[in-house]
C-alpha cells in the first residue's frame, strides 16, 4: 500500500520517544453519531465538503489538534517485546469527542525458522525491532481523520500497531537463552488494549480491531480475545468488531508445488504449521476445540476460524488477492498468460466467493490487488455499486439496530458485497493496473486481453459479442 | 567514517584453498547482515554468500556451495571467507559488502581483493 | 530463485539527454508497500556504488539526474540529463529473499 516508506535511514537515529504515564481521564466524551449518507448519495463531494467546513469550525483550531499525525508510544510494559527484545508500541491520535476506537493491526508477511527470521532482521528490521520506528505516522485511508478521505470513521480515535513480532499477530513466547527471538503478537494486542483503556479507551463505545494481510488474519485470531479481555476487566458495554482486511486466506493447492524453504515459496499450511510451533502460536480458543492437537494451524484459515468468532467481524478481500497468488506461486510478470494458468486464476477467484457465501458482512471486489483499507483511495473501489466505507456504515447501521441475528439487510443498505463476475477486474472500479513493462495504465480490455484471455470465451457466458464486451469494458461499464 | 577492507586474495592453483578475509570500521559491526560479491574479470556482479549479523544463518549461491565456508567474528569486526576446491571459474574480484537493515541494499563496499585460480 | 532480467546491455546516450535502463523480475520482489530493488554504478577499477535503493530513493550524496521507479516485477534507473561522468556500468539487484541477485550489467556510453 501506498505512504509507507516511514522508517528512518540508517545512522539517523531519533531519540527514543517518551514513555509516558497515561493521560488522566478527560470528561466522558460525547458520542459522535453515525452519519447516513442514504439521503445525499447522489451528491457527496458537496456533503462532504458542508461537513468538513462544520467540523473544522466546530473543533478547537488549534494546531496540534488539527495534526493528522499519529504519535508514537513504546509500551510502558517492556517486557512485551518486538523480535529483537526492543519494546513494542502503538501509534496514537486522540479524537477526545468520540467513543469509538480503531485499532489497526499492520502487515508485513511472517517468518517460520531461524533462517528465515535471520535473513528478515537483516534487511527488514521495522518488522522486527522498534529500534527505529519514527515519533509519528500519517493516518490513511480508514485512518485518516479526513473526511473526504474517510467518510466511514473519521472522527474516531486512531491507533496504529506496528507489526514487529512476524508472527501473523499470533505468539506468545518471549526472547530467552533458547529463543534467539521474540514472538509476542498475541500479547502485544493485550497490552496496547490494556494501556489504551488509561487512555480513554475505558469510555468507549465500540472498539474496531482492523487489520491488512498478516493484520488481517491477526483479527480473525484475536478479535474474540480482546473481546473477553475487556470484559474481564470489567468493561462489558465495549462492543468489540473486526474488520479483516486482505487476511482471508485458503488451504489450496499450489500452481505449481515447491519446497518449503522461504517465506514467499512455502506452502501456506507448511509455513503455518512450522510458523505455530516457532512461535508458540495462539488461536481462538473455540476454533482450537474443533481441530486435533497440532492440527492448530486451520485456524489461520478465514473460512475456517470465521464460524467459530462471536463478534461480529466485516470482511474484506480481493477476489485475486496478490499475496493468495504469490504463496501459490503464481507469478504474474507481464507475459501472456497460458490457459492452465488462467483457469487456475478464475478458479481461485471462485473459491475464494464460495468461502464468503456465508459471511453476511464482506466486501469481496473481482480484482487482482492486495489490501485496501488504509489506501488512501479506498473510497474508490464499488460492488455492485456501493463503496467499502458506505458498507461499513451499512454494517455499523445494521449492528446499532440489531440486526445481527437477522439475515434481511437493511433497505437500500447492503453489507454482503462479493462480485460475481468470473474473471480478474472485470469490475471497473477496481484499482488500476499497470503494464509491467511499459509502466503505462491498462484499461481493463487490455489487461485481460494481455492475462491471455480469449474475448470469445469470456463474452458468451454475459450473452454478447467480444466486440460489445470490449466496448463496454474500455467504457468502464 | 564506514570503512570495509578486504585481504587474502592471490594466485593459487586449481584444487587448492585460500580465506579471504574482511575488516570492518566505524560502524557497528554486530548490527548488519554482510554479503560477499563477486566479479569475474570483464563480467558481471555475482553474489555469492550472505552472514547474519549474529552469525547464526549463513547462505550460499548455488555455485559455490559445498566449497566455501562463511563466518565472522563479531568481537574482532571480521567477516570470513574460506574457499576450497578451487576452481579457474573461481577467479575474480571477492567484494565484501554491507547490507542496509533497513532493505538489504549494499551501502557500503569493499575495494574488493583478487584471487586468481590458475596452474 | 528471482532472476532479473537487464536490458539494454549497452547503450549510448548523447550528453544532456536521458538514458533509460529497465530491469525485469521473474517474480514480484514488492512486498507490505516497498520493493527490494536497488541501483548500482560501477567504473572501471572501482567498487560499485549505491545510487538508488528500494526502486525509487535516492541514496545521500547521489545527484538528483538519477530516479528509479516501478513496482511489483518491473523497474527503471532513469538518468537525465545525462553528464558525461555517468559513463559506468549500471546493475539492478533484489534483496527480496535469498538469493540474493543482479541484473547482468548495461553499459552506458556518452555520446
Known amino acids: 500500500s501506498e505512504g509507507r516508506k516511514t522508517w528512518r535511514r540508517r545512522g539517523q537515529q531519533p531519540p527514543p520517544p517518551p514513555r509516558t504515564e497515561a493521560a488522566p481521564a478527560a470528561g466522558q466524551p460525547v458520542e459522535s453519531f453515525p452519519l447516513d449518507f442514504t439521503a445525499v448519495e447522489g451528491n457527496m463531494d458537496s456533503f462532504m465538503a458542508q461537513v468538513k467546513s462544520l467540523a473544522q469550525s466546530l473543533y478547537p483550531c488549534s494546531a496540534q489538534q488539527l495534526n493528522e499525525d499519529l504519535r508514537l508510544h513504546l509500551l510502558l510494559n517492556t517486557s512485551v517485546t518486538c523480535n529483537d527484545g526492543s519494546p513494542a508500541g502503538y501509534y496514537l491520535k486522540e479524537s477526545r469527542g468520540s467513543r469509538r476506537w480503531l485499532l489497526f493491526l499492520e502487515g508485513g508477511w511472517y517468518c517460520f525458522n531461524r533462517e528465515n527470521c535471520d535473513s528478515r532482521y537483516d534487511t527488514m528490521r521495522r518488522l522486527m525491532s522498534s529500534r527505529d520506528w519514527p515519533r509519528t505516522r500519517t493516518g490513511t485511508g480508514i485512518l485518516s481523520s479526513q473526511p473526504e478521505e474517510n467518510p466511514y470513521w473519521w472522527n474516531a480515535n486512531m491507533v496504529f500497531i506496528p507489526y514487529c513480532s512476524s508472527d501473523v499477530w499470533s505468539g506468545a513466547s518471549s526472547k530467552s537463552e533458547k529463543n534467539e527471538y521474540a514472538f509476542m503478537g498475541a500479547l502485544i494486542i493485550q497490552e496496547v488494549v490494556r494501556e489504551l483503556l488509561g487512555r480513554g479507551l475505558s469510555g468507549a463505545k465500540v472498539l474496531l480491531l482492523a487489520g491488512s494481510s498478516a493484520g488481517g488474519t491477526g483479527v480473525l485470531l484475536n478479535v474474540d480475545r480482546v473481546a473477553e479481555q475487556l470484559e474481564k476487566l470489567g468493561y462489558p458495554a465495549i462492543q468489540v468488531r473486526g474488520l479483516a482486511d486482505s487476511g482471508w486466506f485458503l488451504d489450496n493447492k499450489q500452481y505449481r508445488h515447491t519446497d518449503c524453504v522461504d517465506t514467499i515459496t512455502c506452502a501456506p499450511t507448511e509455513a503455518i504449521r512450522r510458523g505455530i510451533r516457532y512461535w508458540n502460536g495462539v488461536v481462538p480458543e473455540r476454533c482450537r476445540r474443533q481441530f486435533q492437537e497440532g492440527e492448530e494451524w486451520n485456524c489461520f484459515f478465514g473460512y475456517k476460524v470465521y464460524p467459530t468468532l462471536r463478534c461480529p467481524v466485516f470482511v474484506v478481500q480481493w477476489l485475486f488477492d496478490e499475496a493468495q497468488l504469490t504463496v501459490d506461486n503464481v507469478h504474474l510478470t507481464g507475459q501472456p498468460v497460458q490457459e492452465g494458468l488462467r483457469l487456475y486464476i478464475q478458479n481461485l477467484g471462485r473459491e475464494l466467493r464460495h468461502t464468503l457465501k456465508d459471511v453476511p458482512a464482506s466486501f469481496a471486489p473481482a480484482c487482482l490487488s492486495h489490501e485496501i483499507i488504509i489506501r488512501s483511495h479506498w473510497t474508490d473501489v464499488q460492488v455492485k455499486g456501493t463503496s467499502l466505507p458506505r458498507a461499513l456504515h451499512c454494517w455499523d447501521r445494521s449492528l446499532h439496530d440489531s440486526h445481527k441475528a437477522s439475515k434481511t439487510p437493511l433497505k437500500g443498505c447492503p453489507v454482503h458485497l462479493v462480485d460475481s463476475c468470473p474473471w480478474p477486474h472485470c469490475n471497473p472500479s477496481c484499482p488500476t493496473v499497470r503494464d509491467q513493462f511499459t509502466g503505462q495504465e491498462m484499461n481493463v480490455a487490455q489487461f485481460l486481453m494481455h492475462m491471455g484471455f480469449d474475448m470469445q470465451t469470456v463474452a458468451q457466458p454475459q450473452g454478447l459479442e467480444p466486440s460489445e464486451l470490449l466496448g463496454m469494458l474500455s467504457n468502464g461499464s | 567514517d564506514v570503512q570495509l577492507l578486504e585481504s587474502g586474495g592471490g594466485l593459487v592453483q586449481p584444487g587448492g584453498s585460500r580465506k579471504l578475509s574482511c575488516a570492518a570500521s566505524g560502524f557497528t559491526f554486530s548490527d548488519f547482515g554482510m554479503h560477499w560479491v563477486r566479479q569475474a574479470p570483464e563480467k558481471g556482479l555475482e553474489w555469492v554468500a550472505y552472514?547474519?549479523?549474529?552469525?547464526?544463518?549463513?547462505y550460499y549461491a548455488d555455485t559455490v556451495k559445498g566449497r566455501l565456508t562463511l563466518s565472522r567474528d563479531n568481537s574482532k569486526n571480521t567477516l570470513f571467507l574460506e574457499m576450497t576446491s578451487l576452481r579457474s571459474e573461481d577467479t575474480a574480484m571477492y567484494y565484501c559488502?554491507?547490507?542496509?537493515?533497513?532493505?538489504?541494499?549494499?551501502?557500503?563496499w569493499g575495494q574488493g581483493t583478487s584471487l586468481t585460480v590458475s596452474s | 530463485d528471482i532472476v532479473l532480467t537487464q536490458s539494454p546491455a549497452s547503450l549510448a546516450v548523447s550528453l544532456g539527454q536521458r538514458a533509460t535502463i529497465s530491469c525485469r523480475a521473474s517474480k514480484s520482489v514488492s512486498t507490505s508497500g516497498y520493493s527490494y530493488i536497488h541501483w548500482y554504478q560501477q567504473k572501471p577499477g572501482q567498487p560499485p556504488k549505491l545510487l538508488i535503493y528500494l526502486a525509487s530513493d535516492l541514496e545521500s550524496g547521489v545527484p538528483a539526474r538519477f530516479s528509479g521507479s516501478g513496482s511489483g516485477a518491473a523497474f527503471t534507473l532513469n538518468i537525465h540529463p545525462v553528464e558525461e561522468e555517468d559513463a559506468a556500468t549500471y546493475y539492478c539487484h533484489h534483496s527480496r529473499e535469498l538469493p540474493f541477485t543482479f541484473g547482468s550489467g548495461t553499459k552506458l556510453e556518452i555520446k
Open positions: 552472514s547474519s549479523s549474529g552469525g547464526t544463518t549463513v
Open positions: 559488502a554491507r547490507a542496509s537493515y533497513d532493505g538489504g541494499y549494499f551501502d557500503c
